[in-house]
Interface confidence: low
């Protein structure tokens, strides 16, 4: 894996064990971008001390990429030409097409909390007047 493992705790196991899930996922929300352009999908897990062991990025039940605490990034072969890892645990989509419009999910596997999921809706516009959502920053 040619990318550095992000600086967070954890390993390759999923969370669980029946603990109270106190965390919340902050996302970029609804965003739009121009056809042919790029967009950063970003989520942030807060309000929990659980270890993040893996983050999956999915679109309509298809895995785009996974970032594993031990292994670093894995990009699904069918998306490797248009998906770039980062920044952080986010995902950059490139060479956008109108078909990229839809729901994207960040899925945080944590221990001991379990699984947290965040939703982002991306609209890819034909015109050059796409309004991007507010810039999202990881604290």
């Amino acid at each position: 894996y040619p990318y550095d493992v992000p600086d967070y705790a954890g390993g390759g196991g999923s969370g669980g064990g029946g603990s109270m899930m106190t965390g919340t996922i902050e996302t970029t929300g609804n965003i739009s971008a121009e056809k042919g352009g790029s967009i950063i999908l970003q989520c942030h897990l807060s309000s929990t001390t659980a270890q993040v062991t893996q983050v999956n990025w999915e679109q309509q039940d298809q895995l785009l990429a996974a970032c594993n605490a031990d292994l670093g990034w894995h990009i699904s072969p069918s998306f490797k030409d248009r998906v770039a890892p980062g920044p952080g645990l986010g995902l950059t989509l490139q060479s956008l097409t109108v078909n990229d419009t839809g729901e994207y999910f960040c899925i945080y596997h944590t221990y001991p909390d379990g699984t947290y999921t965040g939703r982002i809706f991306l609209e890819v516009l034909e015109s050059s007047v796409a309004e991007h959502g507010a810039r999202f920053q990881i604290p």
Epitope: Y1, G10, G11, G12, G13, S14, G15, G16, G17, Q51, T53, N56, D61, L63, A66, N68, A69, D70, L71, H74, S76, H109, Y111, P112, G114, T115, T117
Partner: antibody, heavy 119, light 107 residues
């Protein structure tokens, strides 16, 4: 071709110890989390222990916690299960299994090694 | 821990039949369910993960559906090599837990 081969099983008395090994080949062992799963004779599957690829996360089933120790040697492409204070209810076929990278399912399994705890 | 309950525990079917096995989780596991096939004296084999994703090399007659607490494994047209025991497993959270198994026998 992915291959997982367990060894080290056998007959042991209650209270005794055994060390199981799992030799991996056909893939980059150091990239994958690994599980031990067992199956008592005529029964279903029971997850036993997990170790992440770099050994930074280790989890155990409550039934074996404090008695079993999972470890790995990535240089030797090997997974281990040290079993102490064995009980009759630990009698089972023990399988090592590889965890998928993208989801927490077990995509390749060894053929298993039989552990019998009996006096 | 999450309890996984499979039904039926056994069933008899003929070659060509459509077979459905269900698995229920004691609490929501989103879509994180795997299905395995095991033949006597052999290791389990992964068929489906993440609820509905077919593992590479598995015939398309196997399909999975469901989310939350209720899941189904369907074999659209049973073949002679499909007579085996099938297990579900939740891979949403630790400790990973399996259903009790469903034995598919020849009628």
């Amino acid at each position: 071709e992915v291959q997982l081969v367990e060894s080290g099983g056998g007959l042991v008395q209650p209270g005794g110890s055994l060390r199981l090994s799992c030799a991996a080949s056909g893939f980059t062992f150091s990239n994958f989390g690994m599980h031990w799963v067992r199956q008592a004779p005529g029964k279903g599957l029971e997850w036993v222990a997990f170790i992440s690829s770099g050994s930074s996360s280790i989890y155990y089933a409550d039934t074996v916690k404090g008695r079993f120790t999972i470890s790995r040697d990535n240089a030797k492409n090997s997974l281990y299960l040290q079993m102490n204070s064995l009980r009759a209810e630990d009698t089972a076929v023990y399988y090592c299994a590889r965890m998928r990278l993208d989801y927490y399912a077990m995509d390749y399994w060894g053929q298993g090694t039989m552990v019998t705890v009996s006096s | 821990d999450i309890q996984m309950t499979q039904s039926p525990s056994s069933l008899s079917a003929s070659v060509g039949d459509r077979v459905t096995i269900t698995c229920r989780a004691s609490k929501s596991i989103s879509k994180y369910l795997a299905w395995y096939q095991q033949k006597p004296g052999k290791a389990p084999k992964l068929l489906i993960y993440s609820g509905s994703t077919l593992q590479s090399g598995v015939p398309s007659r196997f399909s999975g559906s469901g989310s939350g607490t209720d899941f189904t494994l369907t074999i659209s047209s049973l073949q002679p090599e499909d007579f085996a025991t099938y297990y579900c497993q939740q891979h949403n959270e630790y400790p990973w837990t399996f259903g009790g198994g469903t034995k598919v026998e020849i009628k």
